[in-house]
């Protein structure tokens, strides 16, 4: 008994297509070994026609394919444009040779059934319409015209020229003539269903002088397109239903027993299982639209159908398109957290995966909005400036080459809760969905900046300090100046890290940034953050305002008289003298875009090199001014 299983007999007619599924036992070896389809000859030899190694015989060229579905333990052989020559005995099997595990399949391709010699064949898809042409002689012009459908014994009227219409064709059948041509009448039947298939007779006149024509109407279910997608990836259903339904509501549904459950439609209906990960996009005025689903799950596999109807629901006799979606669990897309939790006032760092082979692709982050058909406006991207309402609190850090980019959002509010998508302009399968949950903060933030009301005075020295808890002791600390093109990392000094003591004093862990002398360009948002290698952690933000010195008063930096802040301020300040020229934009910076800046700060350079520059959104390394300094020992 063969462990391979499939259809023992497959029968079809010329010109048709078959899709033969072969099942194999669930083992790792079976999933990865060669799959083949071969034809048995009289000698008992089995000649390969197609295999999963890429082999395709000449007689199958352009009309066959073989797809392995390892997660289902099946493989499918699709063969199109069948001829009677394809009739024969075949094997589907597994193994390096055609003597491996196999299953015998008999394929029989028949001639198209014989019909009366004058029969005209119309082949239409479900939901479409057909116009049947019925010629007649001039002498029958005044006579009654009709179309009837053949049943076992009789011919049941569909429509006639006296406006009699069969109840099941009311609103669907029209009998008409075109122009002044008195030798042909037409019958149009719209919203075709499977039940409309069969033999029809159109007739003009009565008795022996009547003109008759035989018509064979074939109504086909659409062949489902096979889609093979990875777990956590995305799929796009491209639906092209034709101009006649351009103004109807569109839907995508999933087959469930006899019904098709609507997942999304253009009337605002959406299945809660797809919340945050689905969009429906009308493409044009020709009835084309697409549905994008991201973050594919195992349970998303199944039989999908798109269609159009004013109700936004599946309706018999309306055009449809179908797909069979398989979700492969052996995914190339890394398993990342699909839910990220933050607290009000805090921050989140979201690691977005992308295809590592496309490190130069443009990266984006968008917020999924469920209203209407759903849309995902871009909030930030490698060449897209941060949206205004996210000023000072959103940045994208690209880490070229490692298959991940990071999006940081701070100053969180409960309004930020929702679904966000990571996407690139490259491989669309790598679109991923993140749900951000924001809870009310119940404790002080981990990172705190002093002074909190930061106003720097033009021409003076100004220092801000970022206090961090001992749990961040071993992580890199950084300051960066935010712009709508990213957050450019600045030289800074970690006061806690230089203490030789093994114990960690909670009150003296701080990282400082000094502006000396303060210039007008220094005004703006600054972030203090922690990171470990390329993994970004928490951040906090502060806005530094710059104002002119009030005349006649000697100004003291507003340090809130905070002793911890003074630790940094008491250190000697060394001018790093970076020229403006050196600090201009660097295209596509590496992880150390500000390396020259770091090297110029003397013997602190080595310690800080690791924190590098995460690379601002489009690689522009604009610093707040050219006068950032380091505390130096």
């Amino acid at each position: 008994k063969s462990p391979i299983f499939g259809p023992q007999e497959v029968s079809s007619i010329e010109g048709d297509s078959v899709s033969i599924t072969c099942y194999y036992p669930d083992t790792s070896v079976n999933r990865h070994t060669r799959k083949y389809w071969c034809r048995q000859g009289a000698s008992g030899m089995c000649t390969t026609l197609i295999s999963s190694n890429g082999y395709l015989s000449k007689e199958y060229s352009g009309r066959a394919n073989l797809i392995n579905f390892p997660e289902n333990n099946t493989f499918v052989i699709n063969i199109e444009q069948l001829t009677q020559d394809d009739t024969g005995s075949y094997k589907c099997g597994l193994g390096t040779s055609n003597r491996g595990l196999s299953f015998d399949v008999s394929l029989e391709v028949s001639q198209v059934p014989e019909l009366p010699s004058d029969t005209h064949v119309y082949t239409k898809d479900i939901g479409r319409n057909v116009t049947i042409e019925c010629p007649f002689k001039r002498e029958n012009a005044p006579s009654k015209k009709s179309l009837c459908k053949k049943t076992n014994q009789s011919c049941e009227l569909v429509i006639d020229s006296t406006e009699k219409v069969n109840p099941s064709y009311i609103g669907r059948a029209k009998l008409f003539m075109k122009g002044t041509d008195l030798t042909v009448f037409y019958v149009n039947i719209s919203h075709l269903t499977h039940n409309d298939a069969g033999l029809y007779i159109c007739q003009a006149g009565e008795g022996p002088s009547a003109d008759k024509k035989n018509v064979d109407l074939q109504v086909l279910a659409p062949e489902p397109e096979l889609l093979y997608k990875d777990l956590r990836s995305s799929v796009t259903f491209e639906c092209d239903l034709g101009r006649e339904v351009a103004n109807e509501a569109k839907y995508l549904c999933r087959m469930n027993k006899e019904t098709c459950d609507v997942i999304i439609n253009t009337l605002g209906k959406r299945d809660p299982d797809f919340e945050g990960r689905i969009l429906i996009t009308p493409k044009d005025d020709n009835g084309r639209f697409s549905v994008l689903i991201t973050g594919l799950r195992k349970e998303d596999a199944g039989h999908y159908q798109c269609g159009a109807h004013s109700s936004g629901l599946p309706q018999e006799g309306w055009p449809i398109q179908t797909w069979q979606l398989f979700v492969n669990e052996e995914s190339t897309i890394p398993n990342r957290r699909s839910v990220v939790k933050g607290v009000t006032g805090g921050s989140v760092a979201i690691a977005c995966p992308y295809n590592p082979k496309e490190s130069s692709s443009l990266k984006y982050w968008c917020r999924w909005e469920g209203d209407g058909n759903g849309h995902c406006p871009v909030l930030v991207g490698t060449q897209a400036q941060v949206q205004e309402e996210y000023e000072g609190r959103l940045a994208l850090f690209d880490q070229p080459g490692n298959g991940t980019y990071t999006v940081i959002l701070n100053q969180l509010t409960t309004e930020d809760a929702g679904f966000y998508w990571c996407l690139t302009n490259g491989d669309s399968r790598w679109r991923t969905t993140i749900e951000l949950q924001v809870a009310e903060a119940t404790r002080e933030p981990n990172l705190e900046v002093t002074p909190q009301n930061a106003t720097a005075v033009l021409g003076e020295t100004f220092t801000v300090s970022c206090h961090y808890p001992c749990k961040f002791y071993s992580q890199e600390k950084y300051w960066c100046k935010w712009s709508n093109k990213g957050c450019h990392i600045l030289p800074s000094h970690d006061e806690g890290a230089r203490q030789s003591s093994v114990s960690c004093d909670q009150s003296s862990q701080l990282v400082s940034m000094t502006l000396n002398p303060v210039s007008k360009e220094d005004e703006g948002w600054y972030w203090c953050g922690v990171k470990q290698g390329q993994t970004y952690g928490e951040t906090t933000a502060i806005y530094i305002a710059v104002e002119e010195r009030t005349r006649g008063s000697s100004h003291v930096n507003p340090t809130d008289a905070n002793a911890r802040a003074k630790v940094a301020l008491e250190e000697e300040v060394v001018d790093s003298s970076i020229s403006e020229k050196e600090n201009k934009a660097i295209p596509n910076p590496g992880p150390f875009a500000n390396e020259r800046e770091i090297q110029n700060v003397g013997d602190q350079a080595q310690e800080n090199r690791a924190s590098g520059d995460a690379g601002s959104a489009d690689g522009q390394s604009r610093s707040s001014s050219s006068k950032h300094h380091h505390h130096h020992h």
Epitope: P7, E9, V10, D16, H194, L220, A221
Partner: nanobody
Framework: EVQLVESGGGLVQAGDSLRLSCAAS????????MGWFRQGPGKEREFVAA??????????YYEDSVKGRFTISRDNAKNTAYLQMNSLKPEDTAVYYC??????????????????WGQGTLVTVSS
């Protein structure tokens, strides 16, 4: 909703033939699947044969022990599936169930792939 009614069961001698019918009320479309399963005394329900169709293409599946003896077929116009059983053996004794599904996906041997079931018809093969 599809209703399935089996008929044709009965008591026969080993080596005899029987033809089971499964009439489906309700609409069967241009694609679908119908299968026959059986449950012998004190045994699990097992796959016997199945027929899947999509437009003009038909796929027939058989369990190894019935290959060459049983034939599954369908009359499209009558919405009926048949199981022609020849060379019957005592081990074929069982209640035979007809199953149907409007979809043509999934392993036809898997009873979970079918949404609609008949009440069953008893076939007894005496030696």
């Amino acid at each position: 909703e599809v209703q399935l009614v089996e008929s044709g069961g009965g008591l026969v001698q080993a080596g005899d033939s029987l033809r089971l019918s499964c009439a489906a009320s309700g609409r069967t479309g241009s694609s679908g699947a119908m299968g026959w399963f059986r449950q012998g005394p004190g045994k699990e329900r097992e796959f016997v044969a199945a027929l899947m169709w999509r437009n003009t293409v038909t796929y027939k599946y058989y369990e190894d022990s019935v290959k060459g003896r049983f034939t599954i077929s369908r009359d499209n116009a009558k919405n009926t599936a048949y199981l022609q059983m020849n060379s019957l053996k005592p081990e074929d004794t069982a209640v035979y169930y007809c199953a149907a599904d409007p979809d043509t996906y999934g392993d036809p041997r898997n009873s979970g792939a079918y949404d609609y079931w008949g009440q069953g018809t008893l076939v007894t093969v005496s030696s």
